[in-house]
Interface confidence: low
């Protein structure tokens, strides 16, 4: 199904316009900003969501050590170019003809250049490390319960196949969720770890992308898990290419 038939809305993406103009009068939803048709039975790609976000009114808006090649999204929001399937185009440029290469989650992986900059391929982000710090609680969460609830969340809310949640680490108050998904592992129809991580990030910030669903209410043995800080690290299948100037 493309969308909720009863009132023609998109359960998985509130940043859409829906109308019963699909085949046979079926409800069809298009993403704001791009006008692309979206599949409302699964997550919308991060690229289309960012594009929709930029088009919306502005007021609507044992722990692992990340490797030296891990990227953090320091550039923040931009209006991306998406390909016909909704993925990020490898090269992104702004209105002033400044260009850069991005990975599959839309994070810059090269220095900025001009229109002559070449980005030969969209490099896949195959490992995402979500680093959370939770608010103080009476005691530490039980690790196995925390692990189960977070795995359940990614499976149920974001429809991410359980095999892509590689690990959940916990050293109070830090929680780390590792998502891993190589190109060879991702089958047709599988939710992309980058999209799941983005939905999770927005949920954690209280900016749920789901239509009409309550915000994220995450509990471990009845105790609310409230996050006060989130950092997301992205590891690509091919290491990023930055000049030494940036690394010092």
């Amino acid at each position: 199904h493309t969308a909720a038939q009863d009132n023609c809305t998109c359960p998985t993406n509130k940043m859409t316009v829906c109308s019963p103009d699909g085949p046979g009068g079926r409800c069809q939803c298009r993403a704001l900003g791009s006008g692309m048709a979206v599949d409302c039975s699964t997550l919308t790609s991060k690229c289309l969501l960012l594009k929709a976000r930029m088009s919306a009114p502005k007021n609507a808006r044992t722990l692992v050590r990340p490797s030296e090649h891990a990227l953090v999204d320091n550039d923040g929001l931009y209006d991306p170019d998406c390909d016909p399937e909704g993925r990020f185009k490898a090269r992104q440029c702004n209105q002033t003809s400044v260009c850069w290469c991005v990975n599959s989650v839309g994070v810059r992986r090269t220095d900025k250049g001009d229109l002559s900059l070449r980005c030969d391929e969209l490099v896949r982000t195959h490992h995402i490390l979500i680093d959370l710090r939770h608010r103080p609680t009476a005691g530490a969460f039980n690790h196995s319960d925390l692990d189960a609830e977070l795995r359940r969340l990614f499976r149920e809310r974001y429809r991410l196949h359980p095999k892509f949640v590689a690990a959940v680490h916990y050293e109070q108050p830090t929680i780390q969720i590792e998502l891993r998904q190589n190109t060879s592992q991702k089958a047709a129809g599988d939710v992309d770890i980058g999209d799941a991580a983005y939905y999770f990030e927005r949920d954690i910030k209280g900016e749920s992308l789901f239509q009409g669903r309550g915000g994220l209410d995450l509990r471990v043995r009845g105790e609310p898990l409230q996050v006060e800080r989130t950092l997301i690290y992205y590891l690509d299948e091919i290491p990023p290419k930055f000049s030494m100037k940036r690394l010092t």
Partner: antibody, heavy 118, light 109 residues
């Protein structure tokens, strides 16, 4: 909305049987489907389920013994080789799965009887 | 995850109250359901997430509990409540013996 089991019957010890669960009236891609059995006069016994991604989970005792498959957009099968008299039971399929949705079985088929006897 | 249900059988008068207990071998985080089964029929869901009534189930049925201990209470017992009741954990999924408790037969006299 319904589920219906088929394929039950009399089989000799050591034989193989494949049961089919056919669903109708709901979108199969949004629900797990679970197999449960009940020996005559006994309690319910969980066998395993297929999740919305086509991922499979089994009870400890059923791992390696039985095979659950999603064979079409409306059918799930339970393959049972090397049957013994102890496998005589009514086999139910149900909508829902462990650790998925509200983690319970909200819709059941009427069941199909499997009798293993020489 | 193994489920222990008590008692195995109980006899109660019409209008009375019956309490059935279910204990999990480890915490199941309130992912517990209760079913009613009558002879020759498939189980019927009564309660899920420990305390939420399934569709069409009268409020005489009440579920409670957390962690490893759960209870089903049926008040104002009617003849139609004579059945076998089962609990079912929905939390563990990969190392499960039987997701169901052994059952409690309720006889209404």
């Amino acid at each position: 909305q319904s589920l219906e089991e088929s394929g039950g019957g009399l089989v000799k010890p050591g034989g193989t049987l494949t049961l089919t669960c056919t669903v109708s009236g709901f979108d199969f891609s949004n629900y797990a489907v679970t197999w449960v059995r009940q020996a005559p006069g006994e309690g319910l016994e969980y066998i395993g389920f297929v999740g919305i991604y086509g991922d499979f989970y089994y009870a400890n005792w059923a791992k390696g013994r039985f095979t659950i498959s999603k064979t079409s957009s409306t059918t799930v099968t339970l393959q049972m080789p090397s049957l013994t008299v102890a496998d005589t039971a009514t086999y139910f399929c149900a909508r829902g799965g462990l650790w998925t949705g509200n983690s319970y079985f909200d819709l059941w088929g009427p069941g199909t009887l499997v009798t293993v006897s020489s | 995850y193994d489920m222990t249900q008590t008692p195995a059988s109980v006899e109660v008068a019409v209008g009375g109250t019956v309490t059935i207990n279910c204990q999990a071998s480890e915490s199941i985080n309130r992912y517990l359901a209760w079913y009613q089964q009558k002879r020759g029929q498939p189980p019927k869901p009564l309660i899920y997430r420990a305390a939420t009534l399934a569709s069409g189930v009268p409020s005489r049925f009440k579920g409670s509990g957390s962690g490893t201990e759960y209870t089903l209470t049926i008040s104002d017992l009617e003849c139609a409540d004579a059945a076998t009741y089962y609990c079912q954990q929905g939390y563990g999924y990969s190392t499960v013996g039987n997701a169901f408790g052994g059952g409690t037969e309720v006889v209404v006299k």
